[in-house]
Amino acid sequence: MNGRVDYLVTEEEINLTRGPSGLGFNIVGGTDQQYVSNDSGIYVSRIKENGAAALDGRLQEGDKILSVNGQDLKNLLHQDAVDLFRNAGYAVSLRVQHRLQVQNGPIGHRGEGDPSG
């Protein structure tokens, strides 16, 4: 029997300093590239080894980036989001949402909330 998967969602402000090769991560998502069903948000898909994000250690693959330097990432085309990061300057403040799997409980009733919703 499959258990229900529960998630703990937390938000964090991460301040990165752009390194010699940039911020050091990849993103997916946008209104024209939905990565998660019914969610056009921007998600981290890769952390580059030895890049600024990896050296900082807080940003993780799968994190949702809510804003960059206070600018909301809602309803952006994918390339517009990429360009926003590229033009964000030397000191970059990211508001991110971490989603951690915390337990496998007993099987839930059919129709319970989908954690990806």
């Epitope: 090769s21 940039g22 990849n26 590239q33 890049g51």
Partner: nanobody, 125 residues
Amino acid sequence: EVQLVESGGGLVQAGGSLRLSCTASGRTFSTYTMAWFRQAPGKEREFVAAITWSGTYYADSVKGRFTISRDNAKNTMYLQMNSLKPEDTAVYICAAVIGSTVDSYSPSDPLEYDYWGQGTQVTVS
């Protein structure tokens, strides 16, 4: 883990054409940044072409002769190679990474990619 499988290589005469395919696993293929590299015996791996969400990139040596494209419904990327020359002889290798870099993209840098295929041999006589 993304798996990449190339096909379509073979022996062709100079001036001829081939179409290579690279089929990938994964439900989010449309988000992949993908590239073709090639390696001839005794030579360094060389960038050929790349395709991102926003465009395509080519090595000067293949510009105007090769065309990179993708079919997201088939989880497949293609390399149409026309006007082939003997110097195009190599093993052609597909590479991919999930998403778009937020940094300056260097399509020819192998460190941009996380996943690599085994390659398909192209011989131009």
